[in-house]
């Protein structure tokens, strides 16, 4: 009786279980009662990453430098090329098909998380007691200067964009 299901790494065709092609190879012809499955290696710059019955290999992704992309992992017959972005840029999607410049955090905001090749800068507002007076993709919020520890007094209050201004204490004569 012909099988209705096949073992792992096999597929059912013409009431027969045929071996799948291994990663890195494509299907040329199905097996028969008398012959094995015929597979052929993928060409250069092509791949198949699973046991398969594909008749065409997939093309390697191109990490186009004009789009800010660079190769993170070279493609092989069994794996696709993995792209990432040049320094200072990050991918616009999970597939990393193009890159955009890392965003900077405006004055009053600090960097909570520095950007990577795949994620943008995460900014946070500077809380009371902290400030940022620059637009930066790296700078965190800095704490206000402690006038007391310098034996000075606050002459001008700090904001989320400016540090406190310290001055000498008024001395009673």
């Amino acid at each position: 009786e012909p099988p209705t299901a096949c073992r792992e790494k096999q597929y059912l065709i013409n009431s027969q279980c045929c071996s799948l092609c291994q990663p890195g190879q494509k299907l040329v012809s199905d097996c028969t009662e008398f012959t094995e499955t015929e597979c052929l290696p993928c060409g250069e710059s092509e791949f198949l990453d699973t046991w398969n019955r594909e008749t065409h290999c997939h093309q390697h992704k191109y990490c186009d430098p004009n789009l800010g992309l660079r190769v993170q992992q070279k493609g092989t017959s069994e794996t696709d090329t993995i792209c990432t972005c040049e320094e200072g840029w990050h991918c616009t999607s999970e597939a990393c098909e193009s890159c955009v410049l890392h965003r900077s955090c405006s004055p009053g905001f600090g960097v909570k998380q520095i950007a990577t090749g795949v994620s943008d800068t995460i900014c946070e507002p500077c809380p009371v007691g902290f400030f940022s007076n620059v637009s930066s993709a790296f700078e965190k919020c800095h704490p206000w200067t402690s006038c007391e520890t310098k034996d000075l007094v606050v002459q001008q209050a700090g904001t989320n964009k400016t540090d406190v201004v310290c001055g000498p204490q008024d001395r009673l004569r």
Epitope: P23, P41, Q59, R70, Q72, Q73, T76, S77, T79
Partner: antibody, heavy 119, light 113 residues
Framework: EVQLVESGGGLVKPGGSRRLSCAAS????????MHWVRQAPGKGLEWVAY????????YYADTVKGRFTISRDNAKNSLYLQMNSLRAEDTAVYYC????????????WGQGTLVTVSS | DIVMTQSPDSLAVSLGERVTMNCKSS????????????LTWHQQKPGQPPKLLIY???TRESGVPDRFSGSGSGTDFTLTISSLQAEDVAVYYC?????????FGGGTKVEIK
């Protein structure tokens, strides 16, 4: 028998141009990726550029980006390297090398051609 | 870019002796998809072009004598010649075949003592 034969080397003035060729035989050229690799006199190996079998994918070393152009003509079984704005530091033996779709390594190298950049 | 560091720069060994050279990469050469380390060794004899010796860290190219063996994973790799022959005098280069730009080590020169 696999053969890669480079030509086009010689003496060039700084700022000048040169076009190197690599003639391939003994294998189906259009099935293979190709590289250029150079070796300065008495120094180690430096990868220069890669072109995929079907011309679709091209990568360059930062040291030559914008100055060198790799290309191929599968009908003529030939690989090329157009070198512009040459500098003294480009002086080297230039090798072409083949990359197959199995190992993904440079499995055959040509004998090389010497490019000397000097005034 | 991945930096490949070879050691020693050179070594002189008697015929028939064992030769070991090392190669260190600044980042892992392990392909996450197929679990192969893309580290390649090339041999360059005096006055000749390089020749592929070993790929995927430990797979000998066809025609390469079995006295040559490669080992390692991740960032640390070794090339061993079990019994040095006169024809093995050469410079041996390890190469990152994992990502572009492809990068080579500075080479290890093997001479006869």
């Amino acid at each position: 028998e696999v053969q890669l034969v480079e030509s086009g080397g010689g003496l060039v003035k700084p700022g000048g141009s040169r076009r190197l060729s690599c003639a391939a035989s003994g294998f189906t050229f259009s099935d293979y990726g190709m590289h250029w690799v150079r070796q300065a006199p008495g120094k180690g190996l430096e990868w220069v550029a890669y072109i995929s079998s079907g011309n679709r994918i091209i990568y360059y070393a930062d040291t030559v980006k914008g100055r060198f152009t790799i290309s191929r003509d599968n009908a003529k079984n030939s690989l090329y390297l157009q070198m512009n704005s040459l500098r003294a530091e480009d002086t080297a033996v230039y090798y072409c090398a083949r990359q197959d779709g199995y190992r993904y390594a440079m499995d055959y190298w040509g004998q090389g051609t010497l490019v000397t950049v000097s005034s | 870019d991945i930096v490949m560091t070879q050691s020693p720069d050179s070594l002189a060994v008697s015929l028939g002796e064992r030769v070991t050279m090392n190669c260190k990469s600044s980042q892992s050469l392990l392909n996450s998809g197929n679990q192969k380390n893309y580290l390649t060794w090339h041999q360059q004899k005096p006055g000749q072009p390089p020749k592929l010796l070993i790929y995927w860290t430990s797979t000998r190219e066809s025609g390469v004598p079995d006295r040559f063996s490669g080992s390692g994973s991740g960032t640390d790799f070794t090339l061993t010649i079990s019994s040095l022959q006169a024809e093995d005098v050469a410079v041996y280069y390890c190469q990152n075949d994992y990502t572009y730009p492809l990068t080579f080590g500075g080479g290890t020169k093997v001479e006869i003592k």
